[in-house]
């Protein structure tokens, strides 16, 4: 059965839903099961960012080794992608140092190995270095390693204070790290840098050097600090013997590019600034940088998280002899998730895993129906999504609600305003042998021509118990069935509009009082089901004090059981 | 001060007719319920029937639907029953009421204002 369409005009009953013990929305096909094959093959990480309530789900998981917990990925996995050359333009320029114009970040250079089956991480993948086999040109100020023939030109740092640590489950692609820089004039060689060399007896000797990217920067720029790091993990140590221009001090950066679908963690293992040093932190990857921390904020043991994969540390130190102070940060891959699903208003949502695969399901307290999608997935990306957006929790017009315990009946819209041309029947039917006791949360109705009628029986001729064409004051008390139904009628003409109505109601034995209930506050009785001789005392929230009716209530009269004075109110002090 | 005042009551063989009228005076509002109760010796009071004074709305005891009719003139703030084929068990005094509290209708709950009665004796 379905819920109809309110009914325009007057005198129409729309459909009515049956349901038992609860008022839910008509059953919305479930969404079909997604084509989308979650695959990855990103490691196992333990995962520092997840909700504690769901670590049994992630747990359980990541020990089956579950491809449906795991990381969605929509491509196969390549090594992370590189930088685009965006890095850090909205950093400060601090003590009026040149502003970053970077040559390092776009690693193009870097060869392109085929992906073991173990994954991006792969263990055994290999630092790429460049081979040159002639000298290179030197160019204005550029500082180059003099090599002879067939020597290697390493790229790792020169001390091993700034090699990327592997010490996680393995390499994330492989490390990419740091490529020739330059300083001076500040020409960055990146790229593959090729070179051939023809010679004989009497031939004059060739070489030709090609430059895949030059980047020419007019400014001085600081000495040749600038490294990547790809890996799940590994540590950022400053510079320790860096040789660079007496008269300019350290402008650092390192580059931390981790797998889409993870974020980066960075933390303050050691840190020890000169004055008028600089540390600062953005997470890269998203539209724009996003600034994290400065040196203020980055004291020994604090964690820096970026919401993105990329990000970016920079560092200016004093020139000689001053500086540099010294830091130690490590940093590690964590699993980004889909944001916390946003609990519907009147209604509930439950979370099986806030990570990729993991899902929201939602449901619609009693008189409520689900607007939107009752199950969420969600979906790996750079930031994970939800594949929908969360569904709303709208007042239904009118059903039936069998086996009635407890529960609530609003007018659609509620707690906005009613529509005008309703017509809205709801009947209540308590389970066998029970009555119903109906309270009024609130009632505000329009002054013309709304009504709200609530019926003793089971359909529309029913003789009324309050009908708001004739009754001027709400009963504080609420009303009593004396069978097991109510009807009630909730209907609005062509003009005006209020909030309409929320109505609570509870079933009760007969023989025994009806449940209790005071907003704000809360009671304590002297026996659970409320027959005849039960006491109950009364007590407010704090904040609040007791108005009206009495602390302590008496259910009394055997043949007709009722409490001796009506529930009291909190009222806000 | 709310008064009202039944008339019309009497002795009547089965099968005949009597209409009651009930005078409510300082009564003012335009909302509310009234209504025709009736008592037999030694039996409890019972809703006979009930009118709404802005909706209109009429509701009947469902053992007495058919022979009794209630109205209202709203000019003359006075309430009526017809009552048609009478019986020996529609014996009873006869009260007017009104009130604009909630409650069941047909039960005395939502009426404040009473009337002294009047007496239907139905006998051959």
């Known amino acids: 059965l379905s819920l109809e369409a309110p009914t325009v005009g007057k005198g129409q009953a729309p459909g009515i839903e049956e349901t038992d013990g609860e008022l839910t929305a008509a059953p919305t096909p479930e969404q079909p099961e997604r084509g989308v094959h979650f695959v990855t093959t990103a490691p196992t990480l333990k995962l520092l960012n997840h909700h504690p309530l769901l670590e049994e789900f992630l747990q359980e998981g990541l020990e089956k080794g579950d491809e449906e917990l795991r990381p969605a990925l929509p491509f196969q996995p390549d090594p992370p992608a590189p930088f685009t050359p965006s890095p850090l333009p909205r950093l400060a320029n601090q003590d009026s140092r040149p502003v970053f114009t970077s040559p390092t970040p776009a690693m193009a250079a870097v060869p392109t190995q085929p992906q073991s089956k173990e994954g991006p991480w792969s263990p055994e993948s290999e630092s790429p270095m460049l081979r040159i086999t002639a000298p290179l040109p030197p160019g204005p100020s550029m500082a180059v390693p003099t090599l002879g023939p067939g020597e290697i030109a390493s790229t790792t740092p020169p001390s091993r204070a700034w090699t990327p640590t592997q010490e996680g489950p393995g390499d994330m692609g492989r490390p990419w790290v740091a490529e020739v820089v330059s300083q001076g004039a500040g020409i960055g060689i990146q790229g593959t840098i090729t070179s051939s060399t023809a010679s004989g007896d009497d031939e004059e000797t060739t070489t030709t050097t090609t430059i895949i990217t030059t980047t020419i920067t007019t400014v001085q720029t600081p000495g040749p600090c600038s490294w990547n790091f790809s890996g799940p993990e590994g540590s950022l140590d400053s510079p320790t013997d860096l040789s660079s221009p007496t008269d300019v001090g350290l402008d650092c950066f390192f580059y931390i590019s981790v797998y889409p679908g993870y974020g980066v963690e960075i933390k303050v293992q050691n840190i020890s600034l000169r004055e008028g040093e600089t540390v600062t932190v953005e997470g890269l990857g998203g539209p724009d940088p996003l600034p994290l921390a400065n040196q203020s904020f980055l004291l020994r043991g604090q964690v820096i998280r970026s919401p993105t994969h990329q990000a970016a540390l920079r560092f200016q130190s004093l020139p000689p002899p001053a500086g540099p102070g010294t830091f130690h940060f490590h940093y590690q891959a964590y699993l980004l998730s889909c944001h916390f699903p946003r609990r519907p208003a009147y209604g509930d949502v439950t979370v099986t895993s806030l990570h990729p695969g993991g899902s929201a399901r939602f449901h619609c307290a009693t008189g409520y129906q689900l607007k939107g999608a009752r199950h969420l997935t969600c979906l790996n990306a750079t930031q994970p999504f939800w594949d929908s957006k969360e569904p709303v929790c709208i007042a239904a017009c009118g059903g039936v609600i069998r086996n009635a315990t407890t529960g609530r009946i609003v007018s659609p819209g509620f707690p906005g305003n009613y529509s005008n041309n309703l017509t809205c029947h709801w009947l209540l039917e308590a389970p066998e042998g029970q009555r119903l006791h109906l309270h009024f949360e609130k009632v505000s109705l329009a002054e013309d021509d709304d009504r709200l009628i609530i019926r003793n029986g089971d359909n529309v001729e029913a003789p009324p118990v309050y009908d708001s064409y004739e009754v001027e004051y709400l009963p504080i008390e609420g009303l009593l069935s004396s069978g097991k139904h109510f009807f009630v009628e909730l209907s609005t003409d062509s003009s005006g509009a209020a909030a309409g109505m929320a109505l609570r109601y509870e079933a009760f034995q007969q023989g025994h009082c009806y449940e209790p209930f005071v907003k704000y506050g809360n009671f304590s009785s002297s026996t659970p089901t409320y027959p005849v001789g039960t006491t109950v005392e009364f007590s407010c929230d704090p904040g609040y004090t007791l108005e009206q009716g009495s602390i302590i209530i008496e259910c009394v009269d055997p043949h007709d059981p009722q409490w001796n004075e009506t529930e009291p109110a909190c009222r806000a002090v | 001060h709310v008064q009202l005042v039944e008339s019309g009551g009497g002795l009547v063989q089965p099968g005949g007719s009597l209409r009651l009228s009930c005078a409510v005076s300082?009564?003012?509002?335009?909302?509310?319920?009234m209504a025709w109760f009736r008592q037999a010796p030694g039996k409890e009071r019972e809703g006979v029937a009930v009118i709404g004074r802005r909706s209109g709305d009429i509701y009947y005891a469902d053992s007495l639907k058919g022979r009794f009719t209630i109205s209202h003139d709203n000019a003359k703030n006075s309430l009526y029953l017809q009552m048609n084929s009478l019986r020996a068990e529609d014996t009873a005094t006869y009260y007017c009421?009104?009130?604009?509290?909630?409650?069941?209708?047909?039960?005395?709950?939502?009426?404040?204002?009473w009337g002294q009665g009047t007496m239907v004796t139905v006998s051959s």
């Open positions: 009421a009104v009130g604009d509290q909630a409650g069941h209708v047909l039960t005395s709950s939502p009426y404040r204002y």
């Open positions: 300082g009564f003012t509002s335009s909302r509310g319920w």
